[in-house]
């Protein structure tokens, strides 16, 4: 039994890191393998992650971690019984994929303005709380070409757009994702989408 693709890990910079790897053949990850991990820290203890299958030869492990700080470094040991298959390390701050924003809501009752709000996925004491920026994706269910992205580069988790920038009388969907420039993170997954019917009063045309 050998590792074909070494484990690669990403952290949510809060409490979970996800490691994925591939074996050289079909493997029952949960019965044959264990991923041991330990924070390099005087007061830490070793933990064991039981991997799950991720395709025939692929394995994935969800590591429960202490609250992350930038200096953290974890040792990783992949075992098959008594055989050490791979040894490595992982710095969560260097491989961050933020959590997806939640509670996306579209407020349509503000005088021909659409107000989209969502929740920051981090608690206020987490470093990323004040460092997330967002991308909001709005698209029409009727017209696949009517697809747009709004970059929200300020910290407030909200976006205002004029309802008239979208077509009236049709349904739209929106979703939002996050990233943090400070740690050069990847984008988060998209939030669940929310749907609304766009309608607004056409301005009276004067000739």
């Amino acid at each position: 039994m050998k590792v074909l693709q070494e484990p690669t890990c990403v952290s949510d910079y809060m409490s979970i890191s996800t490691c994925e790897w591939k074996m050289n053949g079909p493997t029952n990850c949960s019965t044959e393998l264990r991923l041991l991990y330990q924070l390099v820290f005087l007061l830490s203890e070793a933990h064991t992650c039981i991997p799950e299958n991720n395709g025939g030869a692929g394995c994935v492990c969800h590591l429960l971690m202490d609250d992350v700080v930038s200096a953290d470094n974890y040792t990783l040991d992949l075992w098959a019984g008594q055989q050490l298959l791979w040894k490595g390390s992982f710095k969560p701050s260097e491989h961050v994929k933020p959590r997806a924003p939640g509670n996306l809501t579209v407020h349509t009752n503000v005088s021909d303005t659409l107000l989209l709000t969502w929740s920051n996925p981090y608690p206020p004491d987490n470093y990323l709380y004040n460092h997330l920026t967002y991308a909001v994706n709005i698209w029409s269910e009727n017209d696949p070409a009517d697809f747009r992205i709004y970059n929200v580069t300020y910290l407030e988790p909200s976006l205002r757009i004029a309802a008239s920038t979208l077509k009236s009388g049709i349904s739209y969907r929106a979703r939002v994702r996050a990233w943090a420039q400070c740690y050069n993170t990847t984008w988060s997954e998209w939030s669940p989408s929310t749907k609304w019917h766009n309608s607004y009063r056409e301005p009276f045309e004067q000739h």
Partner: antibody, heavy 115, light 109 residues
Framework: EVQLVQSGGGLVHPGGSLRLSCAGS????????MFWVRQAPGKGLEWVSG???????SYADSVKGRFTISRDNAKNSLYLQMNSLRAEDMAVYYC?????????WGQGTLVTVSS | EIVLTQSPGTLSLSPGERATLSCRAS???????LAWYQQKPGQAPRLLIY???SRATGIPDRFSGSGSGTDFTLTISRLEPEDFAVYYC??????????FGQGTKVEIK
């Protein structure tokens, strides 16, 4: 808002015992190492003890064998049991949350050791 | 045990002046594990700098940290009235644990 609220300080005779408490709120207590740091009157800061999320502990040589740090994650609380207290243990004791450094501190509680 | 020695013991300066505080370690310290704190009378310490040079949340940019190995510096570019306090450096070591310097008092001249 992160808060660390301390209690349990007071006057104790040399050789006596005292238990300090620190209640945490505004963060996930169980995922954080916790510490005690003290400051004798007019002196500098001295690290006393720390406890990891899994219960691993460490102590300064000056208190080893006399002080015991513990935590109750269900109550979001940190404790310091101090036995065989000496005059040199008299200080303001702070609880702190952190790891390699201490971003969050309690308000401090005074322990007076005097006959 | 790693010993941190701060100098000077007291720094007498006027508001608006630049303050340079030194912290020297008895053996090499990882920059990732070097921090600076400010403490005012009757108050708990406040984290200013971590990782030798990163400002903690809410700390004004007049505070900066630098250094590596055994020599570290905290600089206050222009002293404000509220900056007069005692400053401590602190290090963490995987075997020796946590130690503080003895402190530098920044007082009004």
């Amino acid at each position: 808002e992160v808060q660390l609220v301390q209690s349990g300080g007071g006057l104790v005779h040399p050789g006596g015992s005292l238990r300090l408490s620190c209640a945490g709120s505004g963060f996930t207590f169980s995922r954080n190492a916790m510490f005690w740091v003290r400051q004798a009157p007019g002196k500098g800061l001295e690290w006393v003890s720390g406890i990891g999320t899994g219960g691993a502990t460490s102590y300064a040589d000056s208190v080893k064998g006399r002080f015991t740090i513990s935590r109750d994650n269900a109550k979001n609380s940190l404790y310091l049991q101090m036995n065989s207290l000496r005059a040199e243990d008299m200080a303001v004791y702070y609880c702190a949350r952190g790891r390699y450094y201490f971003p969050w501190w309690g308000q401090g509680t005074l322990v007076t050791v005097s006959s | 045990e790693i010993v941190l020695t701060q100098s000077p013991g007291t720094l007498s300066l006027s508001p608006g002046e630049r303050a340079t505080l030194s912290c020297r370690a008895s053996q090499s310290v990882s920059s990732s594990y070097l921090a600076w704190y400010q403490q005012k009378p009757g108050q708990a310490p406040r984290l200013l700098i971590y990782g030798a040079s990163s400002r903690a949340t809410g700390i004004p940019d007049r505070f900066s940290g630098s250094g590596s190995g055994t020599d570290f510096t905290l600089t206050i570019s222009r002293l404000e009235p509220e900056d007069f306090a005692v400053y401590y450096c602190q290090q963490y070591d995987h075997s020796a644990g946590w130690t503080f310097g003895q402190g530098t008092k920044v007082e009004i001249k």
